[in-house]
């Protein structure tokens, strides 16, 4: 009897949908695997007789529930199927946005770039897919624990009237208010403000 694949899970980030599993212990030899998806009542092969322990399902529609399955094979024998269901628009992880930061005197000017849909070669981003898309920004003085959060209205934001000659760190994530779903934070960007431009009277 061939044992089934173990720890079968979907690793999906920005709609790059990779089904992953682990090969079970099997004394007779090396196992191969076949992964399929359900398409209108019929299971279709996506990865056949592969020695890999992952299969790319990024071509599936972003909308609706999908049933995927994988089994292990050896010679003419095979394991039972292991099934999972997956809804990309609900389940995909929202990766970190890009962010450009520029210092102008005692202000930080930030521009945000929504993460690209990873399986496409054009300019569609996660912001296109999710109507309620917004950004959360958090910032703090470098070396301190207190963090401040803001929700910009647009793809840019300005933090004004900061302390001069002070390093501030900023990071951003995507947020979907209608789903109460947050994406991953970007890596912090730390910049030092310069002088206060206000002229004394």
């Amino acid at each position: 009897m061939v044992p089934p694949p173990e720890n079968v899970r979907m690793n999906s980030v920005n709609f790059k949908n990779i089904l992953q599993w682990e090969s079970p212990a099997f004394a007779k030899g090396n196992l191969t695997f076949t992964a399929q998806y359900l398409s209108y009542r019929i299971f279709q092969d996506k990865c056949m007789n592969t020695t890999l322990t992952e299969c790319d399902f990024s071509s599936l529609s972003k909308y609706g529930d999908h049933t995927l399955r994988v089994r292990a094979e050896f010679a003419d024998e095979h394991s039972d199927w292991v099934n999972i269901t997956f809804c990309p628009v609900d389940d995909t992880i929202i990766g970190p946005p890009g962010m450009q930061v520029e210092v102008l005197a005692d202000s930080l000017h930030m521009r945000f770039l929504a993460p690209k849909i990873e399986n496409e070669y054009e300019t569609w981003t996660m912001k296109n897919v999710y109507n309620s898309w917004t950004y959360n920004v958090q910032y703090w003085k470098n070396g301190t624990d207190e963090k401040f959060q803001i929700t910009p209205q647009y793809d840019f934001e300005v933090l004004r009237n900061l302390e001069p000659w002070t390093t501030y760190c900023v990071q951003v994530r995507g947020f979907l208010p209608d789903r109460n779903k947050a994406g991953e934070w970007s890596e912090p960007v730390c910049e030092q403000t310069t002088h206060d431009e206000t002229v004394p009277s």
Epitope: Y37, L60, S61, K62, Y63, H66, N119, E122, W124, V129
Partner: nanobody, 126 residues
Amino acid sequence: QVQLQESGGGLVQPGGSLRLSCAASGYTYSSGCMGWFRQAPGKEREGVATINSDGSTNYADSVKGRFTISKDNAKNTLYLQMNSLKPEDTAMYYCAAEPYCSGGYPRWSVAEFGYWGQGTQVTVSS
């Protein structure tokens, strides 16, 4: 919400022509992949023709040279021009859309399209 509405089906003699249309609301054709599928009685739904956001097209072998898929982004309408129709083309024809898809690879599977119309019947018979 995306809605697709097919029209243009009907009864036609072998060798005749039909033009199917698919009007969309809540969606712009320039932003994704579109396709025509068909389902004959007792058979599975199958891909007929697809068109990507860049205008590139793919056809099932059984319709190559006879069918042409096109879209009018200004009218938000997808078309399927069907010439030299054969009895085996008889089926319910469905329009499908997958928003924010560039067509990095051909999509031929039902599971690769998220939105569907109700279908329009095409019957080829003498």
